[in-house]
């Protein structure tokens, strides 16, 4: 059902990385416009991207509230020129979204090693707590701040004169790991949440070598 | 608001398994830990373990693995813990707790009102 | 695993400003061990005051502080008053389990 020459949105995708969070959809769209709303199981609906011809919304400021909410969205399909105007059953066509509970779910961007350094036979490697657009007390909250317990990294390094990889494991931001004295080592981090069942795992990080400008040397 | 509302005392006898419930409202189930802890007089406090409703995924105490179970339904909201093989040691009062809002914060800020388990021939 | 260590019991008077630690037997306690403390009144009674070091939980009054001293969790009471007398437990985080501590007995006379 519907207006004459609109069509309902179909393939609702939510694409959410670090909580950035952009709700996506088909068809482009032929002589109509859309409206999103979002709401949570429990509230009411809130409506974001008016009348656009666009095939995509970004949600982040509303997901961003309740990150631990799970959100449900809806695309409505208007005539263009004709907003006003409704489908038989009285209201615009829509479309919903699936749910998406945005601390289950976003994806876990690509981590960054901060610096590395070695000190005899030990180096330390520090990962970068990435800032997330989730906010408390006016401040920017990290991926750690929100995440706490749940979010390990692994840390994967070898020498660079061999490719067998070694693995570890934190809690933290920080590995302190082994190495053999005069041999330089490579790194590449990833962020894990172990209690998931989708999107564990972020990308790996770029990888980063002992003896590039991003480390420190200390012989003792 | 938050509440944890567990289920009533029970009385078992040696041997036998008990299913102790705790019915979350006030909030997005799915998505806070619930953690279960045991409190015998003069023991304290003891962590049993815990589970992540909207993944099912759990962690437990070692001591405990074997003895307590963690099973969540997130369609009525509710979580709970079965103790098997119950022995004297196994009397106590049982908690659930939710954990707090953001991760730099996780731990015990909702607690139920406790289940008596009573073992006994 | 690791034990925790609170004292026992503390005496105060209203008013005054009192403060309960937390010792890990593994070394120092960091923010990485999600320090939590939690206070339970006669009948059972449980609530979160401080979880992740130092956030306060729902409703919990300003009196209530939570921070690291030295190489211990502490929580501090400014200006207790009488129906603070309660035994508080601490918590520490472990990588991958919770250990609490024997409690401390607070008594505001």
């Known amino acids: 059902s519907g207006t004459t020459n609109t069509v309902a949105a179909y393939n609702l995708t939510w694409k959410s990385t670090n909580f950035k969070t952009i709700l996506e959809w088909e068809p482009k769209p032929v002589n109509q416009v859309y409206t999103v709303q979002i709401s949570t199981k429990s509230g009411d609906w809130k409506s974001k991207c008016f009348y656009t011809t666009d095939t995509e919304c970004d949600l982040t400021d509303e997901i961003v509230k309740d990150v631990k909410q799970t959100y449900l969205a809806r695309v409505f399909s208007y005539p263009a020129g004709n907003v006003e105007s409704t489908g038989s059953a009285g209201e615009p066509l829509y479309e919903n979204s699936p749910e998406f509970t945005p601390y289950l779910e976003t994806n876990l961007g690509q981590p960054t090693i901060q610096s590395f350094e070695q000190v005899g036979t030990k180096v330390n490697v520090t990962v970068e707590d990435e800032r997330t657009l989730v906010r408390r007390n006016n401040t920017f909250l990290s991926l750690r701040d929100v995440f706490g317990k749940d979010l390990i990294y692994t840390l994967y390094y070898w020498k660079s004169s061999s490719s067998g990889k070694k693995t570890a494991k934190t809690n933290t931001n920080e590995f302190l790991i082994d190495v053999d004295k005069g041999e330089n080592y490579c790194f590449s981090v990833q962020a894990v949440i172990p209690s998931r069942t989708v999107n564990r795992k972020s990308t790996d990080s770029p990888v980063e070598c002992m003896g590039q400008e991003k480390g420190e040397f200390r012989e003792i | 608001e938050v509440q944890l509302q567990q289920s009533g005392a029970e009385l078992m006898k040696p041997g036998a398994s008990v299913k102790i419930s705790c019915k979350a409202t006030?909030?997005?189930?799915?998505?806070?830990?619930i953690e279960w802890v045991k409190q015998r007089p003069g023991h304290g406090l003891e962590w049993i373990g815990e589970?992540?409703?909207?993944?099912?995924?759990?962690k437990y105490n070692e001591k405990f693995k074997g003895k307590a179970t963690f099973t969540a339904d997130t369609s009525s909201n509710t979580a709970y813990m079965q103790l098997s093989s119950l022995t004297s040691e196994d009397s106590a009062v049982y908690y659930c707790?939710?954990?707090?809002?953001?991760?730099?914060?996780?731990?015990?800020?909702?607690w139920g009102q406790g289940t008596l388990v009573t073992v006994s021939s | 695993q690791a034990v925790v260590t609170q004292e026992s019991a503390l005496t105060t008077s209203p008013g005054e400003t009192v403060t309960l630690t937390c010792r890990s037997s593994?070394?120092?306690?960091?923010?990485?061990?999600?320090a939590n403390w939690v206070q339970e009144k006669p009948d059972h009674l449980f609530t979160g005051l401080i979880g992740g070091t130092n956030n306060r939980g729902p409703g919990v009054p300003a009196r209530f502080s939570g921070s690291l001293i030295g190489d211990k969790a502490a929580l501090t009471i400014t200006g207790a008053q009488t129906e603070d007398e309660a035994v508080y437990f601490c918590a520490l985080w472990y990588s991958n389990h919770w250990v609490f501590g024997g409690g401390t007995k607070l008594t505001v006379l």
């Open positions: 589970i992540l409703p909207g993944s099912a995924s759990t």
């Open positions: 593994t070394g120092a306690v960091t923010t990485s061990n999600y």
């Open positions: 006030g909030y997005t189930f799915s998505s806070y830990w």
């Open positions: 707790a939710r954990d707090y809002y953001y991760g730099s914060s996780y731990g015990f800020a909702y």
